[in-house]
């Protein structure tokens, strides 16, 4: 028995930040779980982790240097990533493990979300206009 995960196929981070919502076919209310976001086709980089516990505040952290936050819904976890770099454009996968109460459950691998990070476009200053067209 596996949890199904739905993600947007593609998101664009215009200002180097993005909200990625992971929607689950499972109600997380009163469960102890570990939701995580992984970068790359092989999910090699664990971008962000959200620990949910029935009795404690949500714990959100990244061990890989990403600036992330997380919000919990009954059947979703939303990861808010900031300060993304253009070279972090990649496919990102949501993962969920429900530990307590038993039985342990995890998810079928989702299709992932391509996050396209657009660099900040610096507008030319009026005092120093860009090169004019001939």
């Amino acid at each position: 028995n596996k949890i199904l995960v739905k993600q947007s196929p593609m998101l664009v981070a215009y200002d180097n930040a993005v909200n990625l919502s992971c929607k689950y076919s499972y109600n997380l209310f009163s469960r102890e779980f570990r939701a995580s976001l992984h970068k790359g086709l092989d999910s090699a980089v664990e971008v962000c982790v959200v620990y949910g516990n029935y009795s404690q505040q949500l714990q959100v952290y990244s061990k890989t240097g990403f600036n992330c936050d997380g919000k919990l819904g009954n059947e979703s976890v939303t990861f808010y990533l900031q300060n993304l770099y253009v070279n972090q454009t990649d496919i990102y996968f949501c993962k969920i493990e429900v530990m307590y109460p038993p039985p342990y459950l995890d998810n079928e691998k989702s299709n992932g979300t391509i996050i396209h990070v657009k660099g900040k476009h610096l507008c030319p200053s009026p005092l120093f206009p860009g090169p004019s067209k001939p």
Epitope: E32, R34, E97, M99, Y100, P101, P102, P103, Y104, D106
Partner: antibody
Framework: EVQLVESGGGLVQPGGSLRLSCAAS??????????VSWIRQAPGKGLEWIGE???????YYSPSLKSRVTISRDNSKNTLYLQLNSLRAEDTAVYYC????????????WGQGTLVTVSS | DIQLTQSPSSLSASVGDRVTITCRAS??????????LHWYQQKPGKAPKLLIY???SLQSGVPSRFSGSGSGTDFTLTISSLQPEDFATYYC?????????FGQGTKVEIK
């Protein structure tokens, strides 16, 4: 046949660290369906759960020990490890690893245990 | 944390006696009709051995004189006819929530 064999116990100085091993055979630590916990028992006392590791590598720890404990594994050796830091006399105990299945989480197989004595 | 309180802490009994040990949880350990409460036997110098899982299911290879019952917060381990090899310490354990917790143990001694 499922077997768990702990090693690495002995005499440790207060303030020191310990690293215990639990070699598993008869099942794979990285295959879905089973996880392994560390449990300890001080001399003449009851059983205390330390923490656990799932097939995915995710870990869960007892809040009372969380700041001092790390559970890890080496899939190539099918071996589990327990690292406990800043040891004190109260950490003197027999340390067991025990396997659980994902449905009920009961401990169906246990190692023989390894004794750790914290003393100067 | 879920506290488990066993009673009695120790008891003296004779071979052939019916022995009952109780375990009370500080909150329900039931979920979807399953009680996540297990019983173990431990002999001196040995690792614990699983006897009963999910409150009432007998672990493979365990003699049928051992039985478990209960749900919610109140559980019982019964040995219908005590045998010489049953003198040991018995523990209950819950796996409903983390941290997993054990009862303090009940020592069954020879009268």
């Amino acid at each position: 046949e499922v077997q768990l064999v702990e090693s690495g116990g002995g005499l440790v100085q207060p303030g020191g660290s310990l690293r215990l091993s639990c070699a598993a055979s008869g099942f794979s630590l990285s295959t879905g369906g089973v996880g392994v916990s560390w449990i300890r028992q001080a001399p003449g006392k009851g059983l205390e759960w330390i923490g656990e590791i799932y097939h995915s590598g995710s870990t869960y720890y007892s809040p009372s020990l969380k700041s001092r404990v790390t559970i890890s594994r080496d899939n190539s050796k099918n071996t589990l490890y327990l690292q406990l830091n800043s040891l004190r006399a109260e950490d003197t105990a027999v340390y067991y690893c025990a396997r659980y299945e994902y449905y009920h989480y009961d401990f169906d197989y246990w190692g023989q245990g390894t004794l750790v004595t914290v003393s100067s | 944390d879920i506290q488990l309180t066993q009673s009695p802490s120790s008891l003296s009994a004779s071979v052939g006696d019916r022995v009952t040990i109780t375990c009370r949880a500080s909150q329900s350990v039931d979920f979807h009709g399953i009680s996540f409460l297990h019983w173990y036997q431990q002999k001196p110098g040995k690792a614990p051995k699983l006897l009963i899982y999910a409150a009432s299911s007998l672990q493979s290879g365990v003699p049928s004189r051992f039985s478990g019952s209960g749900s919610g917060t109140d559980f019982t381990l019964t040995i219908s006819s005590l045998q010489p090899e049953d003198f040991a310490t018995y523990y209950c354990q819950q796996s409903y929530r983390s941290p997993r917790t054990f009862g303090q143990g009940t020592k069954v001694e020879i009268k």
